[in-house]
Interface confidence: medium
């Protein structure tokens, strides 16, 4: 009755369903209402449709699933579990779908899931077992290779009475399920600190994005185990200085590229080691753009142009000489 469109490989119809009378058997792979499907591209898009739950009738061929711009609110356990399973689903994008809760086992029964994007969801409640699926001390390895968690911090009034950083890290470390993770993006999450154990337990990381957070210091963070790390994004944080231990660890990583732009570097005597290192290292991208923010007299000075005479600290006055 309705001929199919040849305008695009994305279709909400299929040629063998064009006629009103069809001798075909029941079709397990129909496109869900409110979605667009391309069997050729193995892709289903249910984008900006105000869906309140994951469609139950996803086609078994789906390899790339976009569920962005919806109103899902909660991802329950087994949200993508189907019989037969979605065995080929490799890339799942749930960004901007107003998720505030991801429950334990939400991504179970997705044996091929390599890329997961939960960005731009206010995740007030991310279960520690969201990615591992079980509360066992050692879970079955997750197939995830890329985990994108940019801007998942909920508004302050919606946060639980616990550390947001701690909640996220608990989910990353549970059951050591994410040992194979190669890309982790945690940008724009208001992180004040990075729990010290998190990187040690993600040994396969190639790319780590911590940009646009509120990290003040990396003193207690160890990069030593991340021998495969290729890019470390620390732009737009609140870093004041990198100390010797951190500098040595970064220098020891064979493939690393570090991005440090737009941090409020404090150019006093504590900065001397970092300046020396910057002049020698090749690992910092755009190092000539790094400038001082404090003290006032040093503002906008380029770090690479400083020498030891520039980097002084005000003497600490004895209490009797201090003014209020």
């Amino acid at each position: 009755s309705s001929p199919t469109s040849s305008a695009s490989s994305f279709s909400s119809s299929a040629p063998f369903l064009a006629s009103a009378v069809s001798a075909q058997p029941p079709l397990p792979d129909q496109c869900p209402a409110l979605c667009e499907c391309s069997e050729a591209a193995r892709t289903v898009k249910c984008v900006n449709r105000n869906l309140t739950e994951v469609p139950t009738d996803l086609p078994a061929y789906v390899r790339n699933l976009f569920l962005t711009g919806n109103q899902l609110a909660v991802l329950p356990a087994g949200a993508f579990a189907r019989r037969p399973p979605l065995a080929e689903l490799a890339a799942l994008n749930l960004s901007g779908s107003r998720l505030d809760e991801v429950r334990a086992g939400a991504f179970e029964h997705l044996p091929s899931l390599r890329q997961l994007d939960l960005s731009h969801n206010p995740l007030a409640d991310l279960s520690p077992f969201a990615f591992s699926g079980s509360n066992a001390s050692v879970s079955a390895p997750s197939p995830l290779v890329e985990l994108i968690l940019n801007h998942i911090v909920p508004p302050e009034d919606e946060r639980q009475n616990r550390s947001f950083e701690g909640m996220v890290v608990a989910a990353l470390l549970a059951g050591r399920a994410l040992q194979g993770l190669r890309r982790l993006e945690l940008a724009s999450n208001h992180f004040l600190y990075l729990p010290r154990d998190v990187l040690a337990q993600l040994p396969s990381l190639r790319h780590l994005d911590l940009s646009n957070n509120s990290l003040v210091s990396l003193t207690y963070v160890s990069f030593r185990n991340l021998t495969h790390l290729e890019s470390l994004h620390l732009e737009d944080n609140a870093l004041k200085v990198l100390h010797n231990g951190t500098l040595a660890e970064l220098q020891g990583l064979p493939h690393i590229r570090v991005f440090l732009d737009n941090n409020p570097w404090v150019c006093d005597c504590h900065m001397a080691d970092m300046v020396t290192w910057l002049k020698e290292t090749e690992v910092v991208q755009g190092k000539d753009r790094l400038t001082c923010a404090y003290p006032e007299k040093m503002r906008n000075r380029v770090l690479l142009e400083l020498n030891s005479a520039d980097l002084d600290c005000d003497p600490i006055l004895p209490p009797s000489l201090q003014t209020s």
């Epitope: 309705s2 469109s5 909400s12 119809s13 009103a20 029941p26 129909q30 209402a33 667009e36």
Partner: antibody
């Protein structure tokens, strides 16, 4: 020839129940999503409910959510609408309609409709 | 919910003359690939009949004097030369999200 024939309408008191049926023929019923749409006397069209081909997905208009249930029996080529807690504002002609396989094609076949009157 | 606003409310047309009906959605009902907007004709005492699907595609068996156009939020149904049998009410409808909603209808009469 594609045919959709509704039945089950009638006069019913507020708060009571009614079950509408839609018998389909002339196409492979189990391949198609189905809808109910209603039209109050002298008014426009109002979409009521949708069910996917394999009965795994249901959607309802807010005005009927929790009171109406859409279902289908693919072995009998029949679509149903169970209407509970009926109200005067549910008075309308109820049409069943077919989504041609993939829903972006609109509703390509409609039945003649069955009239439901809710009155005390 | 997406609100569909149809204009005009009614239309009186001389046979052989063109007619145009507009439908505006309160938000976009088009993706980069498709427009999820459809047009129906309802003759007196009959069920609606699909005329145009996906904004501009003529349903099988519908005379080619009917045409549809538009994307995003603004859509138009045109009848190039109105005939006596075209009297009835014309509705636009989106299938972008739940709930699907219809326009209020445009009544077409013959002068």
């Amino acid at each position: 020839e594609v045919q959709l024939v509704e039945s089950g309408g009638g006069v019913v008191q507020p708060g009571r129940s009614l079950r509408l049926s839609c018998a389909a023929s002339g196409f492979t019923f189990s391949n198609f999503g189905m809808h109910w749409v209603r039209q109050a006397p002298g008014k426009g069209l109002e979409w009521v409910a949708y069910i996917s081909s394999g009965s795994s997905t249901f959607y309802y208009a807010d005005s009927v959510k929790g009171r109406f249930t859409i279902s289908r029996d693919n072995s009998k080529n029949t679509l149903y609408l169970q209407m509970n807690s009926l109200r005067a504002e549910d008075t309308a002609v109820y049409y069943c309609a077919r989504s041609p396989a993939y829903y972006r094609y609109g509703l390509d076949y409609w039945g003649q409709g069955t009239t439901v009157t809710v009155s005390s | 919910d997406i609100v569909m606003t149809q204009t005009p409310l009614s239309l009186s047309v001389t046979p052989g003359q063109p007619a145009s009906i507009s439908c505006r959605a309160s938000q976009s009902v088009s993706s980069s690939t498709f427009s999820y907007m459809h047009w129906y004709q309802q003759k007196p005492g009959q069920p609606p009949q699909l005329l145009i699907y996906s904004s501009s595609n003529l349903e099988s068996g519908v005379p080619d004097r009917f045409s549809g156009s538009g994307s995003g939020t603004d859509f138009t149904l045109k009848i190039s030369r109105v005939e006596a049998e075209d009297v009835g009410v014309y509705y636009c409808q989106h299938s972008w999200e739940i709930p699907y909603t219809f326009g209020g209808g445009t009544k077409v009469e013959i002068k």
